[in-house]
Interface confidence: medium
């Protein structure tokens, strides 16, 4: 009686169980009563990552440099290529199918978390007593200079974007 189910790594065709092709190989012809399943290795830049009966291998992913991508891990006949972002860029989504430039923190904002290959820069406004006077991917908010510590007086108050300006204390009259 012909089988209705097959063992692991087999498939049912024409009322008989044939062996699946191993990862890295594609199906050329099904087995018969007299012959084994015929498989062929995937070509260069192709892969199959499971035991399969596919007649075509899958193309390796293309890491398009103009989408900000580069190869993180080259594909093999059994694995796909893994892309990541160029330095200074981060993935636009979990899929990481394209990248965008890291966003610098503008003056008045400091870097709380530096950008990574998958996340953008996290900026926060400089609180009172701190400033940032430049656009930067890594600079934090700096504390205002303490004029008192230098035995000087404040000539101009600081802002979130500027440091205080210290000057010599005016003589008491």
């Amino acid at each position: 009686e012909p089988p209705t189910a097959c063992r692991e790594k087999q498939y049912l065709i024409n009322s008989q169980c044939c062996s699946l092709c191993q990862p890295g190989q594609k199906l050329v012809s099904d087995c018969t009563e007299f012959t084994e399943t015929e498989c062929l290795p995937c070509g260069e830049s192709e892969f199959l990552d499971t035991w399969n009966r596919e007649t075509h291998c899958h193309q390796h992913k293309y890491c398009d440099p103009n989408l900000g991508l580069r190869v993180q891990q080259k594909g093999t006949s059994e694995t796909d290529t893994i892309c990541t972002c160029e330095e200074g860029w981060h993935c636009t989504s979990e899929a990481c199918e394209s990248c965008v430039l890291h966003t610098p923190c503008i003056p008045g904002f400091g870097v709380m978390e530096m950008a990574t290959e998958t996340t953008d820069t996290v900026c926060h406004p400089c609180p009172v007593g701190f400033f940032s006077n430049q656009s930067s991917l890594f600079e934090k908010c700096y504390p205002w200079t303490s004029c008192e510590d230098k035995n000087l007086e404040v000539l101009q108050k600081g802002t979130s974007q500027t440091n205080v300006i210290c000057g010599l204390k005016s003589r008491m009259r």
Epitope: H56, H58, Q59, K61, Y62, D64, P65, N66, L67, G68, W89, C91, T92, S93, E94, A95, C96, E97, S98, V100, L101
Partner: antibody, heavy 117, light 106 residues
Framework: EVQLQQSGPELVKPGASMKISCKAS????????MNWVKQSHGKNLEWIGL????????TYNQKFKGKATLTVDKSSSTAYMELLSLTSEDSAVYYC??????????WGQGTSVTVSS | QIVLTQSPAIMSSSPGEKVTMTCSAS?????IHWYQQKSGTSPKRWIY???KLASGVPARFSGSGSGTSYSLTINSVEAEDAATYYC?????????FGGGTKLEIK
Amino acid sequence: EVQLQQSGPELVKPGASMKISCKASGYSITGYTMNWVKQSHGKNLEWIGLINTYTGGTTYNQKFKGKATLTVDKSSSTAYMELLSLTSEDSAVYYCAGTGTGAMDYWGQGTSVTVSS
Amino acid sequence: QIVLTQSPAIMSSSPGEKVTMTCSASSSVSYIHWYQQKSGTSPKRWIYDTSKLASGVPARFSGSGSGTSYSLTINSVEAEDAATYYCQQWRTNPYTFGGGTKLEIK
């Protein structure tokens, strides 16, 4: 709000060339990729190519190599597509579309191109 | 190139019905993105990374799938959903679109 404003409709003669513009506002054009897409007869969408607006690097659909040239002017936040040696097959609506989340997030309103003598 | 085949090409539905359209890829892709286009307007990003709804897209929409088989489902279709929906892949150049599924509301 992010907006892509494309140049107006064009009626051009066979054999001529033309340039479509796509001006970005509401976000910096650099650091995003600008795609160009062709839609014929209000139906199929065909990806023409893309330009990395930061580096100026381009990737084309082989089918449109020699037909379309993509450029960017960072100072005016404008991307351009020049279409060369136009024929009736090139009559279509052309869209610019910026990627932000991996998909094409921001689309221009489209530029209708009619090639006719 | 990767060919994306959408089916059905045209479908008709009544308000309140559940609707599913499919996008089949000729070779395995990691993610599919969906766009909605209404007559005379530009396409709009609708679902990205297979299952994430773009901002402003009603929760009645959902996307799923993997490998070569993907789908877009509308749980309870409304008149405003009448449009053509296109799938798209970023995996291999040329980055292709499907032929579209036109959804008509009775």
